[in-house]
Interface confidence: medium
């Protein structure tokens, strides 16, 4: 299953990055799982994951750094709390969980660049 | 003449981006001209230019947003005062001006990403 995502995204100076993950659904899925993976220095780690019913909001864990909304075959993902050291390739993985058959699609990744802001001067 | 430069550079939160432009000199040039071009939306504009004698500092115009140093066939370029709207492909053009023959080399460009910082809160 084909998954499309932007090649590059810049995090805001507040450490927030948003991008769209779009999948070409071969069937009429009602339950979809979206996972964000980070690849840096050939290491792949899971950033966050959410399962949602088509037409409903994505529910990430309470302590997740991700939030998202879905619209049709598009998922709008937002990752927050990013620091310069979090710069890396963020890969969108989409699984159509229900009904069968199961489909899996993995995007090529979105390179997220993060720049740490300069500290504000102390207010005297 | 081959000119090498990095594919991507992030400007700091102060709007400063630095990158190295390296050229493979076919001869013993004594005078070199370096020009930085910006390509965005298929428009190419000249950002800055400097001519220097090998072994000496690069002299950009006083009001230039560029500064630089040279070491052998490498030029270390710094562009300052960048804003998010300045994000684009910055191309390094190198000309061996003297002695003859004249050589010209153009790099593939460095994509510079710039994020505007959040304003600091007013100090009361």
């Amino acid at each position: 299953m084909h998954v499309a995502q932007p090649a590059v995204v810049l995090a805001s100076s507040r450490g927030i990055a948003s991008f769209v993950c779009e999948y070409a659904s071969p069937g009429k899925a009602t339950e979809v799982r979206v996972t964000v993976l980070r690849q840096a220095d050939s290491q792949v780690t899971e950033v966050c994951a959410a399962t949602y019913m088509m037409g409903n909001e994505l529910t990430f864990l309470d302590d997740s750094i991700c939030t998202g909304t879905s619209s049709g075959n598009q998922v709008n993902l937002t990752i927050q709390g990013l620091r310069a050291m979090d710069t890396g390739l963020y890969i969108c993985k989409v699984e159509l969980m229900y009904p069968p058959p199961y489909y899996l699609g993995i995007g090529n990744g979105t390179q997220i660049y993060v720049i740490d802001p300069e500290p504000c001067p102390d207010s005297d | 003449m081959h000119v090498a430069q990095p594919a991507v550079v992030l400007a700091s939160s102060r709007g400063i981006a630095s990158f190295v432009c390296e050229y493979a000199s076919p001869g013993k040039a004594t005078e070199v001209r370096v020009t930085v071009l910006r390509q965005a939306d298929s428009q190419v504009t000249e950002v800055c230019a400097a001519t220097y004698m090998m072994g000496n500092e690069l002299t950009f115009l006083d009001d230039s947003i560029c500064t630089g140093t040279s070491s052998g066939n490498q030029v270390n370029l710094t562009i300052q005062g960048l804003r998010a709207m300045d994000t684009g492909l910055y191309i390094c053009k190198v000309e061996l001006m003297y002695p003859p023959p004249y050589y010209l080399g153009i790099g593939n460009g460095t994509q510079i990403y710039v994020i505007d910082p959040e304003p600091c809160p007013d100090s009361d």
Epitope: - | T30, E31, R33, M53, M54, G55, T59, M97, Y98
Partner: nanobody, 123 residues
Framework: QVQLQESGGGSVQAGGSLTLSCAAS??????VAWFRQTPGKEREGVAA????????YYADSVKGRFTISQDTAKNTGYLQMNSMKPEDTAMYYC??????????????????WGQGTQVTVSS
């Protein structure tokens, strides 16, 4: 035989202007510069210009006041000095060299030296 001959020196009031000329015979290399020297001090680089005319260098003390230029057809270099100060008083030398990898304000970068022309600025 390469020779450099300076002219145009003299006395001027502070705030005044002078133009020095340097006539070269023969091929003098890649770079022409002006140095100056006051008694008991090292020679100091004032300004330099490349043979193509594209590259110019200036000492911080003269930036914005002095302009170096050349007329390649006449094989002559010029130093236009404006807004002159008493501290500009010195013997001015025209120099030239091949300048492969040297530094413009170092005397060792130059192969040829003129005899010098005296400039005096009075307050």
């Amino acid at each position: 035989q390469v020779q450099l001959q300076e002219s145009g020196g003299g006395s001027v009031q502070a705030g005044g202007s002078l133009t020095l000329s340097c006539a070269a015979s023969g091929y003098t290399g890649d770079l022409v510069a002006w140095f100056r020297q006051t008694p008991g001090k090292e020679r100091e680089g004032v300004a330099a210009i490349s043979r193509t005319g594209l590259t110019t260098y200036y000492a911080d003390s003269v930036k914005g006041r002095f302009t170096i230029s050349q007329d390649t057809a006449k094989n002559t270099g010029y130093l236009q000095m404006n807004s002159m100060k008493p501290e500009d008083t010195a013997m001015y030398y025209c120099v030239a060299g091949w300048h492969v990898g040297g530094t413009w304000y170092k005397t060792s970068s130059y192969d040829y030296w003129g005899q010098g022309t005296q400039v005096t600025v009075s307050s």
